[in-house]
């Protein structure tokens, strides 16, 4: 009720707190001598529900029956209206609409750690829309009882503040929660448990790992636990993995040997604890320990390939290339690669350690039989050496793969296909597909890529280091013992018409014909593999169609003769380049007049 209603009263029957769906009677009555000019028939009493007029009556009192009130609080205000004056407030009252509490469900109690306190949680059920008090009761052996009340509005948790001890771990305790509000009360089903049921150990702490003799195979995990812990769960995984390895151990006493860790790998370790085989719950997982396992000597062997280049009559350049070992094969940080070059007949050998590179170039005599061995070394040792006899990889024409083709296969992939060599195909021990960006002038600094293919394969998808709009020189080698044959082709993953035409840099006259020389189109403007050049010419100031000569593209070619020009006629000449996607724009125009005699 609004405090200090001097002019009258508002009363609510049967109660100002009602169950949802109930009906109430509201009465507004004026106190003596509080009406309009003391004439009661002029009194107009008006009942408002908040700000909405719901009833009125002339006289000293007003009765109203109200139904359908919503959950929550509704304010009713009674006002008096007299002729020729504003309405004045007489009094007011709130009606509280709610429901009785539902039975609390799923009561469960837990004690975090042996030194913790007992706390219980439950589900309240639907909101009552009234102040609802919860009382939690715990009874134990020897008629001991504890009780705690919750004054919080949405109460579903209470901590007794008492600690259960393991003196009699099988003793029974019973918890019950009761909800009470103005419309009723309800109690949960009792929950009965023992010390072992509800104590949830603290997670293990102070986790450490030790590797005996810096070896991954002798690894022990150490941790600290509460005194009564019987079981532990260990989980561990490489830091870059989402999947855990799980181990259950009993009576570990704070240590466990791990036997299946990989070398030189960062792991994450976590441990959880439990007091009893089948009672109680697991602790939370401990904080993670991150640790790197020690190195072990590399396993596996390097994939090695090579290129030979003729220098002069007595010398040749050998370029060796190798691929990094996988992380699981390297088993540590590779400190250097050891390359040994040996002349097989004379026994001369030279060894070199290479750091920071996966290639090595040297010059050797063209005579003799040469072999190389390459291995990778980390702090613990070296991989087994990969041995290769240096031979002429393309010498055996009968071993050359046939009908080599290279076709674009989606984004940044090229599918290379071939037919086995004419010579007995079963003699092929393996194919090697090699590719490198095509650079006019055969630049030896261009990175080399390769993959190995089994002898029964006649195709390979190359995708490593493949860029769009770049032309690659692709070779397929067939290897058989100490012989090799090869075939090559140009290929690209994506192409379009070149961005520019060749630049004519000179036109010279030779015996009645001309020789045109040009600069290659920059690689970044070729937009794929060039197929042809076209040379166009027409008489200056003529509107006739130009004549043209189409030349198949060859990497090293940058000049071509034309012998169909008339003497003493001035011609305009230009060039274009073509890929499979189309023709470039014109290169520069040059004028030329042949001085020689007419044929």
């Amino acid at each position: 009720k609004i405090d200090a209603c001097k002019r009258g009263d508002v009363t609510v029957k049967p109660s100002h707190v009602i169950l949802l769906g109930s009906t109430v009677n509201i009465t507004c009555s004026l106190k003596p001598r509080q009406g309009c000019f003391h004439y009661s028939r002029r009194n107009k009493l008006i009942l408002y529900k908040f700000d909405r007029r719901i009833n009125f009556h002339h006289g000293h009192s007003l009765n109203s029956q109200v139904t359908g009130l919503p959950l929550g609080t509704t304010l009713f205000v009674c006002k008096l209206a007299c002729i020729n004056s504003d309405e004045i407030q007489i009094c007011g009252a709130e009606i509280f609409v709610g429901v009785a509490p539902e039975q609390p469900q799923n009561l469960s109690c837990i004690q975090k750690g042996e030194q913790g306190t007992v706390a219980c949680t439950w589900e309240r059920g639907r909101d009552t829309h009234l102040y609802t008090e919860y009382t939690l009761q715990l009874s134990g052996p020897k008629n001991l009882t504890w009780q705690k009340q919750c004054k919080d509005i949405y109460c579903d948790y209470l901590d007794f503040g008492i600690n259960l001890t393991p003196e009699s771990p099988e003793s029974n305790f019973t918890a019950k929660v009761t909800a009470v509000n103005s419309l009723g009360s309800s109690s949960s089903l009792p929950s009965t448990f023992t010390f072992l049921d509800i104590v949830r150990p603290l997670p293990p702490w102070d986790i450490r790992i030790k590797f005996q003799k810096a070896s991954v195979s002798r690894c022990t995990l150490y941790w600290r636990d509460e005194g009564l812990v019987l079981l532990n769960r260990l989980r561990y995984r490489p830091s870059n993995s989402r999947l855990w390895n799980m181990v259950n151990v009993t009576k570990a006493k704070g240590r466990h040997d791990l036997l299946d860790l990989k070398p030189f790998t960062e792991y994450e370790f976590q441990i959880s604890s439990k007091l009893h085989l089948y009672k109680g719950s697991w602790s939370d997982w401990s904080e993670s320990l991150r640790a790197q396992t020690p190195e072990e000597e590399p396993t596996g062997m390097l994939d090695v390939w090579y290129m030979k280049r003729h220098i002069d009559y007595s010398r040749q350049q050998i370029s060796l290339f190798w691929k990094n070992l996988s992380v699981s094969e390297a088993r540590g940080k590779i400190l250097h690669y050891q390359v040994t070059l040996q002349e097989l007949t004379g026994g001369k050998a030279m060894t070199q350690n290479i750091t920071g590179h996966t290639s090595w170039t040297t010059v050797i005599p063209r005579t003799g039989n040469w072999a190389v061995a390459v291995s990778a070394a980390n702090s613990k040792g070296s991989s087994l050496p990969t041995r290769i006899n240096i031979m002429n990889l393309c010498e055996a024409g009968l071993l050359a793969p046939r009908q080599v083709s290279a076709n674009s296969e989606g984004m940044d992939n090229i599918l290379v296909t071939w037919q086995p060599p004419r010579k007995d195909p079963s003699a092929v021990q393996e194919y090697v597909v090699e590719w490198r960006e095509l650079h006019p002038g055969g630049d030896t600094q261009v990175p080399l890529n390769w993959l190995r293919s089994r002898p029964y394969n006649v195709s390979a998808l190359i995708s490593e280091n493949i860029k769009s709009y770049i032309c690659y020189e692709i070779r397929v080698y067939a290897l058989s013992g100490d012989q090799g044959g090869c075939s090559s082709i140009l290929g690209n993953s994506k192409h379009k018409a070149p961005l520019s035409g060749p630049h004519i840099n000179a036109i010279t006259e030779e015996k009645g014909s001309i020789l045109i020389s040009w600069n290659s189109i920059p690689v970044q403007e070729q937009m794929g593999c060039l197929l042809h050049y076209r040379i166009y010419w027409k008489e200056r100031d003529s509107n006739s169609q130009p004549q043209l000569c189409e030349i198949p593209y060859r990497v090293s070619q940058n000049s071509h003769p034309i012998n169909s020009l008339q003497p003493r006629v001035t011609y305009v000449l230009w060039m274009t380049a073509l890929t499979a996607a189309g023709e470039s724009s014109h290169g520069n125009e040059r004028e030329f007049c042949l001085q020689g005699k007419a044929n």
């Epitope: 009720k1 609080t73 829309h129 102040y131 919080d152 509005i153």
Partner: nanobody, 115 residues
């Protein structure tokens, strides 16, 4: 037990504005209405505005169109924004939380509208 503390009152010229605040202690207020009342000298305390727990506002005729009530349950605070103030709005303004166990009132904050 709920305590209520009003603030924001003061002297303002006719036509001016004030914003009153009322902060509660004890989170039970979030399920109840929060109300503003006022009491002018020599008069009884009268209702001005209410806001339900779900945020629905209601106003007495004298406040409608000029006053706005709002609440912030996280801060357990109710506000009354008063615009176009008139001399007859001069009063002590009280905040109230009605519960089925009884009403909780603040101490009040004085609003004076005068030129």
């Amino acid at each position: 037990q709920v305590q209520l503390q009003e603030s924001g009152g003061g002297l303002v010229q006719p036509g001016g504005s004030l914003r009153l605040s009322c902060t509660a202690s004890g989170n039970i207020v979030s399920i109840y209405n929060m109300d503003w009342y006022r009491q002018a000298p020599g008069n009884q305390r009268e209702w001005v505005a209410s806001i339900t727990s779900s945020g629905d506002p209601y106003y007495d005729g004298s406040a409608k169109g000029r006053f706005t009530i709002s609440r912030d349950n996280a801060k357990m605070t109710v506000y009354l924004q008063m615009n176009s103030l008139r001399p007859e709005d001069t009063a002590v303004y009280y905040c109230k939380v009605p519960t089925e166990k009884g009403n909780y009132w603040g101490q009040g904050t004085q609003v004076t509208v005068s030129s």
